[in-house]
């Protein structure tokens, strides 16, 4: 007799994720030189440890500190980039300006990106058929709770300018829900953050409204400035064009606004 | 809880080396968990991170101090120590040394503990 098994609205654990997390560990470490000491082995398991036997909507911080504590890694404080919904775009910017960072450009960031897992309680077994949505079942489950873990180290290791990719596309530009609006955003340290600067990416070629204006960013400065960092904030009209001038900023073209 | 205490001269003369000691209490220095570094707050200007030590024994310094600045550990006192040569009134400040948790993204900026701060004023 087949046993019951818990049906979650969201999509099950991501095919081959084991395999997956152990081959993204091996080909990080091999590329950054500072990360060649992690044991990839202990990795996956302290990963395992997080999750398997457990009810996935039971899922606590303290669940992730030991992949945490293999995780540790140092980030230059002053090149860190947060992104909101243009994940995308901020990566490619990344892959140019070598020496800025996203969080998935961290080995922690970099296991888990794009990955969807969870177990079940009392079992061994990953749960390949669903996993608990966030809005629908619970917002104490595995992979919220990574995201959630690691997104507030990263803002707690930001200093001087810290810079934020906004997607000018949505109709809410700053969205309070958002990872970056309702982790991040509180967990930058006055004391170290001196300004946050918002690059606000537009979608539409011809788009040529200042959507620093918007009242959602308006809404984000008032949050920044509330807690003592200043903020600043610039259009980037032509995301192509940026990226392009990032890659050869001698270029006769990158002297005019992008 | 981790307690970290500053201790050292009050005044030094310009062009000396200014010298820090912290005290860790409540854990040991010489643990994987915690990280360790100075910053200090001139009269009237924000915070300015010096400098930190990792488990590892590497160190990173700020830029516009490193070549006047050593940080190192006494595992055998719980204690680490801030040199900071060639003083001049600039660098009349409220120093702290700080520690910060090991684990996951962590910056050059220690800040989940911080001493209470002493304040070294550089005059002849």
């Known amino acids: 007799v087949p046993r019951w098994r818990q049906q979650w609205s969201g999509p099950g654990t991501t095919k081959r994720f084991p395999e997956t997390v152990l081959a993204r560990c091996v080909k990080y470490t091999e590329i950054h030189p500072e990360m060649r000491h992690v044991d990839c082995q202990s990795v996956w398991d302290a990963f395992k440890g997080a999750f398997i036997s457990k009810h996935p909507c039971n899922i606590t911080e303290e669940d992730y500190q030991p992949l945490m504590k293999l995780g540790t890694q140092t980030v230059p404080c002053n090149k860190i980039l947060l992104w909101s919904r243009i994940k995308d775009l901020a990566h490619q910017f990344t892959q140019v300006q070598r020496d800025m960072f996203t969080l998935e450009d961290t080995l922690l960031g970099y296991l888990a990106d794009d990955l969807t897992w969870c177990g079940e309680f009392n079992t061994s077994k990953i749960n390949y058929q669903s996993c608990p949505d966030w809005r629908k079942d619970c917002s104490n489950n595995p992979v919220s709770v990574f995201w959630k873990t690691v997104s507030r180290r990263f803002a707690e290791a930001a200093c001087d300018v810290v810079h934020v990719m906004l997607n000018g596309s949505r109709s809410k530009i700053f969205d309070k829900n958002s990872t970056f609006g309702s982790v991040e955003v509180h967990n930058l340290q006055p004391e170290k953050v001196q300004t946050l600067e918002a690059w606000v990416i537009h979608g539409g070629r011809e788009d040529s409204r200042d959507l620093c204006q918007d009242p959602t960013i308006k809404e984000l400065e008032s949050i920044i400035s509330k807690r003592n960092i200043q903020f600043s904030c610039k259009n980037i009209y032509r995301p192509d064009k940026f990226l392009q001038c990032v890659k050869n900023p001698e270029d006769s073209s990158c002297t005019s606004e992008i | 809880q981790l307690q970290l205490q500053e201790s050292g001269p009050g005044l030094v003369k310009p062009s000396e080396t200014l010298s820090l000691t912290c005290t860790v209490s409540?854990?040991?220095?010489?643990?994987?968990?915690?990280?360790w570094g100075w910053i200090r707050q001139p009269p009237g200007k924000r915070l300015e991170w010096i400098g930190t030590?990792?488990?590892?024994?590497?160190?990173y310094y700020n830029p516009s101090l490193k070549s006047r600045v050593t940080i190192s550990v006494d595992t055998s006192k719980n204690q680490f120590s801030l040199k900071l040569s060639s003083v001049t009134a600039a660098d009349t400040a409220v120093y702290y040394c700080?520690?910060?948790?090991?684990?996951?993204?962590?910056?050059?900026?220690?800040?989940?503990?911080r001493g209470q701060g002493t304040l070294v004023t550089v005059s002849s």
């Open positions: 409540g854990g040991s220095i010489s643990s994987s968990d915690y990280y």
């Open positions: 700080a520690g910060g948790d090991s684990y996951g993204p962590v910056g050059q900026w220690p800040s989940d503990y």
């Open positions: 030590i990792y488990y590892s024994g590497s160190t």
